[in-house]
């Protein structure tokens, strides 16, 4: 089978601090040494890029300094964390994996993780 399969959880609930974590696992049809992982957000059939990182197999994922994503990798598994989420960011987050090097190139796209974000209630003022 030449197509690459990507698995990710169907649903994740963000923490009260607006942090959501999920695992993105891919079945590699080739022996890639350089992999690119992209998180996409799909809302109303529009797809936008949330963050992306390219890493060497065996090394850590490095997102840009200003990225809202962090992650670690272990074999064909990537642990992704998205920070700074608010209720309006609730949506479908798709894990896209590309085996970049050596050729041939392979693309794998997960079915998406529905991330639910609930803004915390503001603390009531205390009267003493």
């Amino acid at each position: 089978c030449k197509a690459m399969h990507v698995a990710q959880p169907a649903v994740v609930l963000a923490s009260s601090r607006g942090i959501a974590s999920f695992v993105c696992e891919y079945a590699s049809p080739g022996k890639a040494t350089e992999v690119r992982v992209t998180v996409l957000r799909q809302a109303d059939s529009q797809v936008t890029e949330v963050c992306a990182a390219t890493y060497m197999m065996g090394n850590e994922l490095t997102f840009l300094d200003d990225s809202i994503c962090t992650g670690t990798s272990s074999g064909n598994q990537v642990n992704l964390t998205i920070q700074g989420l608010r209720a309006m960011d609730t949506g479908l987050y798709i894990c896209k994996v590309e085996l970049m090097y050596p050729p041939p190139y392979y693309l794998g796209i997960g079915n998406g993780t529905q991330i639910y974000v609930i803004d915390p209630e503001p603390c009531p003022d205390s009267d003493f």
């Epitope: 797809v47 090097y101 392979y106 693309l107 794998g108 796209i109």
Partner: antibody
């Protein structure tokens, strides 16, 4: 408006060279992988080459490997195809195409015709 | 290299009819399959990606289905502007390959 405009096509003798350009506008060019696809007269579509957003990764069809070189200049929002050792079978309309976030080729230029003949 | 087969090469319909085109891959491409429309003298236009998702601005009379090796593209009710050549393409691995195309012409 999202747009790709190719240029540089023309008539060239077998063994000759040509450089195609593709000018992008209306989107953040540096964020997208790009492709060249060709179509011989009366025939179907054939993928030629692909280049990643930062030029780090490049792929070629076997039919052009060693003869064609893809490149890009993100500062100029431009994609290029340097074609050397041209053959009659390279005669085609050459299209540049953007790779969409989900993988397919979502935006295409109008094409530029390359004719290789003596 | 993954080979895509489209059959037949030409299909003839009258406006208003339903058109169903097929594309078969030599090995599994999962759902990494797109459909393009091309009219004479024009560039291809993306219609369907991911086997069944419509591209932005594409009318809902166009639809796609299938996964693995067998795919179907359907135009529910042919409009005069739909008579063109339709190509399938796999984009899951390089080299990215296209089918030979199916021409939909007027009966």
């Amino acid at each position: 408006e999202v747009q790709l405009v190719e240029s540089g096509g023309g008539l060239v003798k077998p063994g000759g060279s040509l450089r195609l350009s593709c000018a992008a506008s209306g989107f953040t060019f540096s964020s997208y992988s790009m492709n060249w696809v060709r179509q011989a007269p009366g025939k179907g579509l054939e993928w030629v080459s692909s280049i990643s957003s930062s030029s780090s990764y490049i792929y070629y069809a076997d039919s052009v490997k060693g003869r064609f070189t893809i490149s890009r200049d993100n500062a100029k929002n431009s994609l290029y195809l340097q074609m050397n050792s041209l053959r009659a079978e390279d005669t085609a309309v050459y299209y540049c195409a953007r790779v969409g976030l989900m993988g397919p080729f979502d935006i295409w230029g109008q094409g530029t015709m390359v004719t290789v003949s003596s | 290299e993954i080979v895509l087969t489209q059959s037949p090469a030409t299909l003839s319909f009258s406006p208003g009819e339903r058109a169903t085109l097929s594309c078969r891959a030599s090995q599994s491409v999962s759902s990494y399959l797109a459909w393009y429309q091309q009219k004479p003298g024009q560039a291809p236009r993306l219609l369907i990606y991911g086997a069944s998702s419509r591209a932005t601005g594409i009318p809902d009379r166009f639809s796609g289905s299938g996964s693995g090796t067998d795919f179907t593209f359907t135009i529910s009710r042919l409009e005069p502007e739909d008579f063109a050549v339709y190509y399938c393409q796999q984009y899951g691995s390089s080299p990215f390959t296209f089918g030979p195309g199916t021409k939909v012409d007027i009966k």
